[in-house]
């Protein structure tokens, strides 16, 4: 049938926040930009069926499934999902092409499956079939990056086996120390898998995707620098590949560079070197020294020489599994509450962690430094002197590491009242754990002088909220005292704050709150 | 990154038999049409067999109709080829290749082959 | 079954230049139709789908037209790396079907 019209199928993905079913019209939201299904006739199908490429949809995306007709004259349309028939309203663009779209928002197992679209023109009828399912996000990886020399040529590949195929970038640069940081105006930003620029000082690869990003940098020792105060570190797995640049610049090229393992010459094949003119007509050499897949026995001291430099090392550990090596006894601060404070975690760590803080059930974000002993930091400092416990958890692929942090703030106490007919009780949260005393207002004591003793029974730390102590205090009612007034107080080394109760007959109790320094 | 490899090929007597399968990677298999497409050496491509992404429908070339068979197992992720009552006009490169859509008539992303020589 | 005719069957071209190969089915196949490169000792990669549709990633010097019985794999400046054997293939009905291709040299 040569009448048919020209369709074309695209999908298009939205940014959006709203939340609902399945809408067969255009729906205002931001955009990315179509992606072509590919919608072609089926061969040999009984009736006209055109066919779209596979949609899959993350839970809770929104799409666009649109369709364009190239065909003369109106056209109508109906929707089928799941056997029901949803309504159709197709209009014209600026080609006069007919569009139809069926909007999906915040996809859900129940929105998966199969959407045919009947469309009726002048000349012909035909169906136009998609398949939308929700995208399996458990299957989802990221692995770290690795670095292989790329055959015949001086150039490194960087490869991550991650799903769905990551975005692999360079990040280079040519500074020291905090200019590399990763927004700098000093780092450049290379997305592709192989480099051939390999002078630079700071060379990293990362790889990213729906998962996040991860990063490998490629662990140099530059002969021009003073060597670390302790003996560099790398740590591998068995398997894993090893490289380690070795760096030198001199006024002319009349000096070599030599990789050495505890001594001895590393075999050919093991090694590779490459040179070139800086700007100021000096002579950069790199020698890189690599195992494809590292054993037990690559482990020891890495020594790069050179005839014109003095020669430094590194020590590579070649271990069977991962770790984190870290001190796991949880810790107790206490502090004022305008002091600036932050927590940290000192660790040493193989793969690099992912981290978590998390305060009163929610996570926030973890940043991670690396020191100069091999040792990196996470520090947190967003606590807002909220006082209570708080949690860093780490883990690698083969590790995990929890370390607990009880904060304190000093402050004098806040107390807060309750009455029932048989008691009346007092809470306190300020730190120090507060005391408590009982007063009773009486003609004789206007001033709430009188102490009471007896009935009085005080808990400290009642419950923790989130890490939180609180303090309470309980005067069980008597004859003695019913239809006064009494007056609970706490007090610790920072200031006292009481609390007036009328103690009568069951009812709304009239609190009265003082506050005295 | 999507990846299709075959395996299985290999010397077969005229008669004789060969299954051929083909692992894919980087995708959801079972959202995807499959096909084998051969090619005879230092000749052109030739469409031998499809089969939709439920595996309910399968489709193939007359000359084979009968002797092969296309199957897939989207548990496993792995489409297979089983050859029959091979014939020296079989001897080929044999390749998987991705349809686009859940039918899979045109093909986006092909193995790199597997060589089936049917020789007595 | 649909008979795919390719003409030339080869040809030698400069590096710039355009280039222009035909594809004629024996019935009309109205846009079912792919095109495909294959370069010498690799597997064939998908250029254009729907006569005219451009596969992604694919360099925008690869255009394709056509539609019924006639279409047209045009290249509009012949880059080095475009040295490959180019194949038409129908969708229209079962069996699908492939032109004997074309071979493009440089000159």
């Known amino acids: 049938n040569q009448d048919l019209p020209v369709i074309k199928c695209v999908l298009i993905n939205h940014k959006n926040n709203d939340s609902s079913v399945g809408k067969s019209s255009s729906y205002p939201m931001v955009s990315e930009s179509p992606e072509d299904l590919g919608c072609a006739l089926r061969p040999q199908s009984s009736g006209t069926v055109y066919e779209a490429a596979a949609v899959e949809v993350d839970v809770s995306a929104s799409i666009t499934l649109q369709v364009l007709v190239d065909a003369p004259g109106n056209i109508s349309c109906l929707w089928v999902f799941k056997h029901s028939s949803l309504n159709c309203q197709p209009h014209f663009d600026l080609q006069n092409r007919g569009v139809v779209s069926m909007v999906i928002l915040k996809m859900t197992e129940t929105q998966a499956g199969e959407y045919l679209l009947f469309i009726q023109s002048e000349a012909t009828n035909y169906t136009i079939l998609f398949t939308v399912s929700i995208r399996n996000t458990l299957l989802y990886t990221l692995r770290r990056p690795y670095f292989r020399k790329m055959e015949n040529q001086d150039a490194l590949v960087c490869i991550s086996e991650s799903v769905p195929e990551p975005i692999v970038e360079w990040v280079l640069c040519d500074s020291q120390g905090e200019s590399c940081k990763e927004e700098s105006p000093a780092v450049v930003k290379k997305e592709e898998k192989v480099l051939h620029e390999l002078f630079g000082t700071d060379i990293r690869c990362c790889a990213r995707n729906e998962l996040g990003r991860e990063c490998t940098r490629l662990f140099t020792i530059d002969l021009n620098q003073t060597p670390q105060t302790t003996l560099p570190q790398l740590f591998l797995k068995v398997g894993e590949p090893l490289w380690i640049r070795c760096k030198a610049v001199h006024v002319n090229h009349g000096f070599g560079l030599t990789w050495e393992l505890e001594n001895k010459a590393l075999e050919e094949g093991n090694y590779f070197e490459m040179s070139t003119y800086s700007t100021n007509r000096t002579m950069i050499r790199i020698l890189f020294a690599f195992v494809s897949s590292v054993a037990r026995n690559d482990t020891g001291y890495y020594t790069c020489s050179s005839s014109k430099h003095p020669s430094q090392s590194a020590l590579v550990t070649i271990v069977e599994k991962g770790f984190i090596n870290a001190t796991n006894s949880s810790e107790d601060y206490e502090i004022d509450q305008y002091e600036e404070f932050c927590f940290s975690v000192r660790f040493k760590a193989y793969p690099q962690i992912r981290c978590t803080w998390t305060f009163s059930r929610k996570s926030f974000p973890c940043e991670q430094k690396g020191l100069d002993n091999g040792y990196s930091i996470s520090k947190f400092c967003n606590h807002k002197h909220q006082p209570g416990e708080y949690i860093f958890h780490a883990e690698n692929d083969d590790a995990q590491f929890t370390k607990m942090f009880t904060l304190n703030i000093r402050r004098k106490p806040q107390v807060l009242a309750e009455a029932s007919a048989s008691q009346a009780s007092c809470f306190s949260d300020g730190y120090p754990l507060p005391s408590w005393t009982w007063k009773k207002c009486s003609d004789k004591s206007p001033n709430c002088t009188e102490e009471i003793t007896e009935g009085v029974w005080n808990r400290k730390a009642n419950r923790k909220v989130f890490g939180q102590w609180v303090s309470s205090s309980t005067l069980n009612m008597s004859e003695a005292i019913k239809g006064f007034l009494v007056k609970c107080c706490a007090y610790n080394s920072l200031g006292t704050s009481c609390e007036t109760i009328l103690l009568n007959s069951p009812g709304p109790f009239p609190f009265i709150q003082d506050n005295i320094s | 990154e999507v990846q299709l490899l075959e395996s299985g090929g290999g010397l077969v007597q005229p008669g004789g038999s060969l299954r051929l399968s083909c692992a894919p990677s980087g995708f959801t298999f079972s959202n995807y049409g499959m096909a084998w497409v051969r090619q005879a050496p230092g000749k052109g491509l030739e469409w031998v067999s499809s089969?939709?992404?439920?595996?309910?429908?399968?489709y193939y070339r007359d000359s084979v109709k009968g002797r092969f068979t296309i199957s897939r197992d989207n548990s496993k992720n792995t489409l297979y080829l089983q050859m029959n009552s091979l014939r020296a006009e079989d001897t080929a490169v044999y390749y998987c290749?991705?349809?686009?859509?859940?039918?899979?008539?045109?093909?986006?992303?092909w193995g790199q082959g597997t060589m089936v020589t049917v020789s007595s | 079954d649909i008979q795919m005719t390719q003409s030339p069957s080869s040809l030698s071209a400069s590096v710039g230049d355009r280039v222009t190969i035909t594809c004629r089915a024996s019935?009309?196949?109205?846009?079912?139709l792919a095109w495909y490169q294959q370069k010498p000792g690799k597997v064939p990669k998908l250029l254009i789908y729907n006569a005219n549709s451009l596969h992604s990633g694919v360099p925008s010097r690869f255009s394709g037209s056509g539609s019924g019985t006639d279409f047209t794999l045009t290249i509009s400046s012949l880059q080095p790396e475009d040295v490959a054997t180019y194949f038409c293939q129908q969708y229209y009905d079962y069996p699908l079907t492939f032109g004997q291709g074309t071979k493009l040299e440089i000159k």
């Open positions: 019935e009309g196949i109205h846009n079912g």
């Open positions: 089969i939709h992404s439920g595996g309910g429908d399968t």
């Open positions: 290749a991705r349809g686009r859509t859940p039918t899979g008539y045109y093909f986006d992303h």
